[in-house]
Interface confidence: medium
């Protein structure tokens, strides 16, 4: 075979076996799963249940408001990205249960594991878009009053999705199914044809575009926003801002292990002990990244409870309150100096 990374998205290799050979083949005499795989299965199960139900609820709540409320558009798109990724989980779950055997065919191998990467790129690009929106609301309120509309928000989301699809293509193209021996099984993974440079390039691009660059820009963005909000009176109830910061922070926390192990594996020799250890942890890192797909609804509910007191409202109305609050006050379009100042303060309720 060719240098094959067996697993979910893109890391996790075989050491080779002409076919796909796991760098750490399943013990030939054992039918028991490794501890990291068992933990991954538990996480996958929880993520699937919470992610499908939670994101479906978020989609339902925000879909009605998305025509007129810009925040609803952002949260709707994030939920759709997460929901799509959750749909692949039963397949990935089944594969791990069968010691990474992939009985679902080549097309499924290309598409389903790529969904989490599509989710990663879509999520971070949407978060970047949301963050830009937050930034503009605080620093360019007049521009927002004039131009910030649902149409522009949908265009921004479409661009984010288009770029996400574009960035997922390399993973999609390199995914293949191969045969593994002793005992026989079919594995689904990424085949770089032993081209370490290509593998490293993909890993570096993913790390930079999907993690480091967004981390840097969003950190700067929110530093400015938070400094501004905290420097003003009457800006302490920054509901949407708190939610967005929590969502952004969780994104980086849960993607960190996957990104770190991925970049390390692309630079390590497949026979090295560190590589072998990381390979064993691959499914766990992927499952950890998958937590992103169910964490947002949890954040929304927790935020809603914080803002509403105990659950006095129904879940949908609680979510509606968190997700569809509009940030820009639509008043007169002729501004005096005092109006601008007042508005800058009001828009802190982001």
């Amino acid at each position: 075979m060719n240098s094959f990374n067996y697993t979910t998205p893109d890391y996790g290799h075989y050491d080779d076996k002409d076919t796909l050979d796991l760098n750490t083949p399943v013990d030939k005499t054992s039918n028991t799963l490794r501890v990291p795989d068992i933990l991954a299965l538990v996480i996958f199960a929880v993520v699937f249940l919470v992610g499908v139900l939670g994101n479906a609820l978020v989609v339902w709540v925000t879909a009605f408001e998305a025509k007129r409320t810009i925040n609803a558009i952002w949260f709707l798109n994030l939920a759709v990205a997460d929901f799509l990724s959750c749909l692949a989980l039963p397949i990935l779950f089944t594969s791990i249960v069968q010691h990474h055997h992939w009985p679902f065919g080549g097309a499924a191998c290309s598409i389903l594991p790529s969904l989490i990467l599509l989710n990663m790129y879509a999520s971070i690009l949407l978060l970047a878009t949301i963050s830009a929106d937050r930034f503009l609301l605080v620093f360019k309120p007049i521009w927002c009053q004039n131009f910030r509309g649902a149409g522009l928000a949908w265009i921004a989301c479409a661009v984010a999705w288009g770029l996400a699809l574009l960035l997922t293509i390399p993973s999609f193209l390199y995914r293949v199914v191969r045969e593994e021996y002793f005992p026989p099984k079919v594995l689904c993974g990424v085949d770089y044809s032993h081209d370490k440079r290509r593998e490293r390039a993909v890993a570096i691009v993913r790390l930079v575009l999907g993690f480091l660059w967004p981390l840097l820009t969003l950190t700067i963005c929110y530093t400015f926003i938070l400094l501004r909000t905290w420097s003003r009176r009457a800006t302490r109830s920054t509901k949407t801002l708190k939610v967005v910061v929590a969502v952004v922070a969780s994104f980086f926390i849960f993607w960190l292990p996957y990104q770190v192990t991925g970049i390390m594996m692309s630079f390590l020799e497949p026979s090295s002990p560190t590589f072998l250890l990381l390979n064993k942890l691959d499914s766990l890192c992927v499952s950890f990244a998958y937590i992103n797909c169910c964490i947002n609804p949890i954040i929304y509910v927790v935020a809603g409870q914080g803002f509403q007191g105990r659950l006095r409202k129904s879940l949908p109305s609680l979510l509606r309150n968190v997700l569809t609050e509009e940030s820009v006050v639509r008043e007169s379009k002729s501004f005096t100096r005092s109006t601008v100042d007042t508005m800058a303060q009001k828009t802190q309720a982001v």
């Epitope: 045969e179 021996y181 005992p183 026979s271």
Partner: antibody
Amino acid sequence: QVQLKQSGPGLVQSSQSLSITCTVSGFSLISYGVHWVRQSPGKGLEWLGVIWSGGSTDYNAAFKSRLSITKDNSKSQVFFKMNSLQADDTAIYYCAKNSQLGNAMDYWGQGTTVTVSS
Amino acid sequence: DIVMSQSPSSLAVSAGEKVTMSCKSSQSLLSSRTRKNYLAWYQQKPGQSPKLLIYWASTRESGVPDRFTGSGSGTDFTLTISSVQAEDLALYFCNQSYDLLTFGAGTKLEIK
């Protein structure tokens, strides 16, 4: 076309080691594994081991302690080394390319006839 | 280890006749995951290296004449030569690759 050419000594002293080199052409060692098999009148065909495309190996348990298979991808060479040879190790030794389909061996070397003398 | 048993050990037939040889394994070679039988057949003519004929129990290797047919599943397998030719004089081996690799002792085909 695919070829596997073997080179190594025909005669080995008892308790000494046997080294055979298998030089391949027509395919790349970074994409295909190479098996080693021997054939003796008394025992028929015996699978000895395999080196896979990424460099990992699987060995026949009966030979694991005294067998080593390595390779040099850039030179398209696979190296077979067996230690502590005895008279019953006298056989024809073959290298063969893995087919990737059913783990079969679709191309074989010409064979190296090895006689272990005491 | 999986033990492979071949029968008969030798047989002599006339050109044009149909011949069948058997191969049995000590455990099933059918993978429940891939739904394939990990059994191959090889032909070794006198003074030559073995040549792959059949893999996955019934898939003919490219370039192999269609008079060679592999069949069977699980533990019982058969190689059939529908119309033996003079050039088919050879030793025929079966080989399992389900759990490492082991070979049968071979069936020697002679032409009357």
